[in-house]
């Protein structure tokens, strides 16, 4: 049903929501304070425009009772609960921020009248791409897909000659949540990725993908999985690998492979990691010192979402239009703003867009290189490294299938 | 045309206090994290306490934790070191530089814009 809206007569209210099922493990209290930085850049930015306004965030707690698995298995039902809770206490505000869960961003997404614009850090998932008042500020699964098919039919650099078109996909079940969406992706078989590739095969157990690693018989060199080194060990170990596999591991929000001094394991050398350039964030920030890796993402994405709101509100009401319209709800898309970090540039369907870079171990430094970028926003691939130094034969990346090719 | 002027700097007796202020023209301040530098005669200029854009964040130094503190007033394109118990070897030159985001950041080279200075000396 339709809720008034604290939004008008000078006031804008953002509705935060701080979910108990969340995509990531974040202590509530760095959402707090990452909302709380955002707001006083955008009451300074604001004021700085000559705009004599105000704007405040009312935190929605979920009471936790019922919905306390504390991830995003039970966040469904959590979400419309705490719709209800914004509903009956009258408390709507311009813009709703949270949920990060793909279950109840699509659910909340449903079944309410969203005449306003929810901003979600996460909702990775594929039924939440092209949803029309839905803004997402960390890496969709979409964007990976298309970056995947767009790397396997590369054919044209120094250091990839070959076109793929076959890949296993190892997916047990224990991932993160933003794994669990990106390799969710990756199998569904109506999926972009699915209708590109000629062949792939989902190994679920371990030893599948153990055995895997030296079999003769293999119908791909090419493994797609996601998270972080140690997640590798874990299941790879100091096994020995077939000369022509390649390990593609998805491993987005983490910074560790630039830091200074990180040293790269010898069982990362037959490994290309996937991750998001660090761009201007700054590792020896405060803003980051206390956060894991992943999680500094996380509280960031919620930052942005407060920079995002002031900025679209900015634009209103230099304007002088109506920020409880469709329109405005409509607007969170296709433009580029101020983030925390520098520009954040959003797609036509409110998805942020992003550098990813593809790193290499260098088989001389032990140092994680980058082999090549991708800018999601142009579904473009910049080679980096012309001549890296490969653990593969010639220095080329081999075929994906076994017995063409290097060997 | 970005400035950055500092006050409140002096002489005091070592245990004693002082306020430094740094008031910033040229651009919007809240977009920029703040910091304090300060620079003995003939030692390299070394970071002492950082605020965000926003004031939400801080860092300070290993050297001045617990006794310096930090603050900002967008409002007024301030920022602003409290000094207490102070020490000897905190006599400096104190420096505010403005960073290039509105991160938390505590080296040099993440910092675009330096004031004059502003000398604090502690007597014992």
């Known amino acids: 049903s339709q809720v008034s809206q604290n939004c008008h007569n000078g006031s804008y209210e953002i509705s935060v929501l701080m979910m108990g099922n969340s995509a990531f493990a974040e202590p509530l209290k760095n959402l707090e304070d990452a909302v709380n930085e955002g707001l006083e850049i955008v009451r300074g930015r604001l004021q700085n425009a000559g705009l004599n306004v105000t704007v405040n965030a009312t935190f929605m707690y979920s009471d936790g009772l019922i919905h306390n698995s504390g991830d995003c298995r039970s966040s469904t039902c959590e979400g419309l609960d705490l719709l209800r809770k914004i509903s009956n206490a009258q408390r709507m505000g311009c813009v709703l921020i949270g949920p990060s869960c793909t279950y109840s961003t699509f659910q909340m997404y449903l079944d309410t009248e969203l005449s306003y614009p929810m901003i979600s850090a996460g909702s990775f998932g594929l039924s939440c791409d092209y949803k029309e008042t839905l803004t997402r500020l960390m890496s969709p699964a979409r964007k990976l897909m298309y970056f995947l098919v767009n790397f396997w039919k590369t054919n044209d650099l120094p250091f990839k000659t070959y076109s793929w078109s076959t890949s296993y996909v190892y997916k047990n079940g224990t991932e993160t949540e933003d794994c669990f969406w990106y390799l969710n992706a990756l199998e569904a078989s109506v999926s972009y990725f699915s209708h590109e590739l000629g062949f792939k095969v989902v190994l679920r157990q371990d030893k599948e993908f153990q055995d895997i690693l030296m079999d003769h018989n293999r119908k791909s060199n090419v493994i797609i999985m996601c998270g972080g080194p140690e997640f590798l060990y874990k299941l790879k170990g100091d096994r020995a690998v077939a000369e022509d596999i390649v390990i593609i591991l998805v491993d987005l929000f983490n910074d560790q492979y630039f830091e200074d001094n990180v040293t790269a394991p010898d069982y990362m050398k037959n490994v290309l990691v996937l991750t998001l350039s660090p761009g201007n964030s700054l590792l020896n920030s405060s803003f980051s010192r206390n956060l894991s890796p992943t999680k500094r993402d996380f509280a960031l994405a919620y930052l942005n979402g407060i920079l995002l709101f002031g900025h679209m509100l900015k634009i209103f009401l230099e304007n002088g239009e109506n920020i409880t319209t469709p329109k405005f709800a409509h607007a969170f898309r296709n433009l580029t703003f101020e983030g925390y970090d520098g520009p954040v540039t959003l797609d036509d369907w409110g998805d942020v867009d992003s550098t990813m870079v593809l790193l290499y171990t260098s088989v001389d430094t032990k140092k994680y290189k980058v082999l090549l970028t991708y800018d999601t926003h142009v579904n473009k691939t910049y080679p980096v490294d012309m001549s890296p130094t490969f653990t593969w034969k010639n220095s080329k990346l081999p075929n994906d299938i076994t017995g063409r090719g290097p060997q | 045309q970005v400035q950055l002027v500092e006050s409140g700097g002096g002489l005091v007796q070592a245990g004693g206090s002082l306020r430094l202020s740094c008031t910033a023209s040229?651009?919007?301040?809240?977009?920029?994290?703040m910091g304090w530098f300060r620079q003995a005669p003939g030692k390299e200029r070394e970071f002492v306490a950082a605020?965000?854009?926003?004031?939400?964040?801080?860092d300070f130094a290993d050297s001045v934790k617990g006794r310096f503190t930090i603050s900002r007033d967008n409002a007024k394109n301030t920022v602003y070191l409290q000094m207490n118990s102070l020490k000897p070897e905190d006599t400096a030159l104190y420096y505010c530089?403005?960073?290039?985001?509105?991160?938390?950041?505590?080296?040099?080279?993440?910092?675009?814009?330096w004031g004059q200075g502003t000398q604090v000396t502690v007597s014992s």
């Open positions: 530089a403005r960073a290039r985001t509105p991160r938390v950041v505590n080296r040099r080279h993440e910092y675009d814009y």
């Open positions: 040229g651009g919007t301040f809240v977009n920029y994290g």
């Open positions: 605020i965000s854009g926003g004031g939400v964040y801080r």
